[in-house]
Interface confidence: medium
């Protein structure tokens, strides 16, 4: 391990689109990649009339966008679809919002996916 | 170094069978998932099927689907795929390519592909 | 399945110039888009995934951009050993897509 770096090795996992992609709903997800390269965890979110809805969470691959972020935080203004990664094992469990320029309540995330 | 080597191809008749192979060295086969690839003379990549890192999902595009099987076999390394009910239209270079997660993820290394043929 | 649309199919330019090959999706698929180089009988080679980062040994040249259903790949300064066919792909959801593809060739 490098020191400062926290190294992620497993990511929670879910997918909204499960039956279609044909994996589990719901999970942890180890993650592979080269040796050289950095893992990241992701969350995907929509905020439907303030109601909390996943899309997916998982392992994500090296991108310098999420490097030494341990909390996955969306910091663009009002996307449709929201998008955190981080860096550290399954740090993608909770996800915020927090544009940036702007002072807002985060958007934790009070959703428990059902198993399937 | 990440080497992937298809073999199996050929001509066949259309109806007929084939099955092709993907020998993979250089990295850590079982922590991958694996796909097939193919690209008609003179068009562009359409995705044919995919298989998770231990062979327990596998996904096929709609033009295959019932006709073509992804399988591995991670003690020897080897990604396959068995082409049943050839047509004319699945005439075109097969590449094997690999990716990092199941889902969501770059096919970041490919074979040199092999080139399956059918005609009659 | 997500549509994946490419513009424009061909260009030619000259070594130096500052190419942009654009790619549009059916549907927003936030950053889950890779793009390859391929040249002629050869296997492509991925050159950009998650929309913006360069895969291994890829020059600077190349970036990457886009999020939701808009996407550009752009060689800063097009160099000779550039000039090939470059495909946008999703990997948001299965079957995984490609776009038609953008031929780059010598003016």
């Known amino acids: 391990a490098i020191l400062g770096r926290s190294e992620t090795q497993e990511c929670l996992f879910f997918n909204a689109n499960w039956e279609k992609d044909r994996t589990n709903q719901t999970g942890v997800e180890p993650c592979y990649g080269d040796k050289d390269k950095r893992r990241h965890c992701f969350a995907t979110w929509k905020n439907i009339s303030g109601s909390i809805e996943i899309v997916k969470q998982g392992c994500w691959l090296d991108d310098i966008n999420c490097y030494d972020r341990t909390d996955c935080v969306e910091k663009k203004d009002s996307p449709e679809v929201y998008f955190c990664c981080c860096e550290g094992n399954m740090c993608n469990e909770k996800f915020s919002y927090f544009p940036e320029m702007e002072v807002t309540q985060p958007t934790s995330n009070p959703v428990t996916p059902k198993p399937p | 170094e990440v080497q992937l080597l298809e073999s199996g191809g050929g001509l066949v008749q259309p109806g007929g069978s084939l099955r092709l192979s993907c020998a993979a060295s250089?990295?850590?086969?079982?922590?991958?998932?694996m796909n097939w690839v193919r690209q008609a003379p003179g068009k562009g990549l359409e995705w044919v099927a995919g298989?998770?890192?231990?062979?327990?999902?596998?996904s096929y595009a709609d033009s295959v689907k019932g006709r073509f099987t992804i399988s591995r076999d991670n003690s020897k390394n080897t990604l396959y795929l068995q082409m049943n009910s050839l047509r004319a239209e699945d005439t075109a270079v097969y590449y094997c390519?690999?990716?990092?997660?199941?889902?969501?993820?770059?096919?970041?290394?490919w074979g040199q592909g092999t080139l399956v043929t059918v005609s009659s | 399945d997500i549509q994946m649309t490419q513009s424009p199919s061909s260009l030619s330019a000259s070594v130096g110039d500052r190419v942009t090959i654009t790619c549009r999706a059916s549907?927003?698929?936030?950053?889950?888009v890779n793009w390859y180089q391929q040249k002629p009988g050869k296997a492509p080679k991925l050159v950009i995934y998650?929309?913006?980062s360069r895969a291994s040994g890829v020059p600077s040249r190349f970036s990457g951009s886009g999020s939701g259903t808009d996407f550009t790949l752009t060689i800063s300064s097009l160099q000779p050993e550039d000039f090939a066919t470059y495909y946008c792909?999703?990997?948001?959801?299965?079957?995984?897509?490609f776009g038609g593809g953008t031929k780059v060739e010598i003016k």
């Open positions: 298989i998770n890192y231990n062979g327990g999902y596998t």
């Open positions: 250089g990295f850590t086969f079982s922590s991958y998932s």
């Open positions: 792909q999703q990997s948001y959801n299965l079957p995984l897509t």
């Open positions: 390519a690999r990716s990092a997660n199941w889902h969501d993820t770059a096919l970041d290394y």
């Open positions: 549907q927003s698929i936030l950053s889950f």
């Open positions: 998650a929309a913006t």
